[in-house]
């Protein structure tokens, strides 16, 4: 079976690498534009230059192309705690990241939010905070993990998953409650 190709891929595959088929004349292969530039005019004929122009400020192309317009530079999303790691250039998009001691949580493929790395208070660091993953904490005895924080077993309700980890404490609390009856 031959995989289905889109029109643009079909047109490009007839020409050697680094060239594309002239949209009005499929016997002509034009040279693609370098990264940092975009297609202003197709080449007039075989062996003749493609008219490529540099991307304007606020736009870029990161690879060789025959795009009619450069791509708009991304903006770092302040409301998500993002900071600019490197600014947009004609051949590279803005790079956004997080501050020191923060990690990225991806809500979707193209949206991340910065959160503070957990400090593992009342516990120990099992795995250090990574660029895209929070610290993994192991809690001390008498504490259980909730929302990546070590919480005292006195806050453990019977209905919660903490009951196994906090079983001795819960039994103690139950015992003291029962012993007070007459």
């Amino acid at each position: 079976l031959v995989p289905h190709l889109g029109d643009r891929e079909k047109r490009d595959s007839v020409c050697p690498q680094g060239k594309y088929i002239h949209p009005q004349n499929n016997s002509i292969c034009c040279t693609k534009c370098h990264k940092g530039t975009y297609l202003y005019n197709d080449c007039p004929g075989p062996g003749q230059d493609t008219d490529c122009r540099e991307c304007e400020s606020g736009s870029f192309t990161a690879s060789e192309n025959h795009l009619r317009h450069c791509l708009s530079c991304s903006k770092c999303r302040k409301e998500m705690g993002q900071v600019e790691i490197s600014s947009c250039t004609v051949d590279r998009d803005t790079v956004c990241g997080c501050r020191k001691n923060q990690y990225r949580h991806y809500w979707s493929e193209n949206l991340f939010q910065c959160f503070n790395c957990s400090l593992c208070l009342n516990g120990t660091v099992h795995l250090s905070c990574q660029e895209k993953q929070n610290t993994v904490c192991t809690c001390h005895a008498g504490f259980f993990l909730r929302e990546n924080e070590c919480v005292s077993c006195s806050n453990c309700k019977k209905s919660l998953e903490c009951t196994k980890l906090c079983l001795p404490q819960i039994e103690n609390v139950k015992g003291t409650e029962d012993s007070g009856t007459t």
Partner: nanobody, 119 residues
């Protein structure tokens, strides 16, 4: 006490439109980034859109870009989601939420409103 109450859901034919509202109370609405999320039957939570406090430069998931518009009225403490050119795959429970601050979970979000798109 934070309260978020969605309305405006319902049954609509493919290609149709709906406008969802989210009435907020119990916090300073004008200071918070607000989010629309959705959960389709048997699927996980999907981030649909969010809007910063000043209403500028909202974010849209690729799946809704060009069809949905998020907006807010800070004087009415209300968040909106205008949904046009609806598709069967937009069928879900839509909830509004406050942008999380402490970690990647929603501390405050509404019960949701069901949107059903029939083809």
């Amino acid at each position: 006490e934070v309260q978020l109450l969605e309305s405006g859901g319902g049954l609509v034919q493919a290609g149709g439109s709906l406008r969802l509202s989210c009435a907020a109370s119990g916090f300073t609405f004008a200071h918070e980034t607000m989010v629309w999320v959705r959960q389709a039957p048997g699927k996980g939570l999907e981030w649909v859109s969010h809007i910063p406090p000043d209403g500028q430069d909202p974010f849209y998931a690729d799946s809704v870009k060009g069809r949905f518009t998020i907006s807010r009225d800070n004087s009415k403490n209300t968040l909106y989601l205008q949904m046009n050119s609806l598709r069967a795959e937009d069928t879900a429970v839509y909830s509004c939420a406050l942008l999380p601050k402490r970690g990647p979970w929603f501390d405050y979000w509404g019960q949701g409103t069901l949107v059903t798109v029939s083809s």
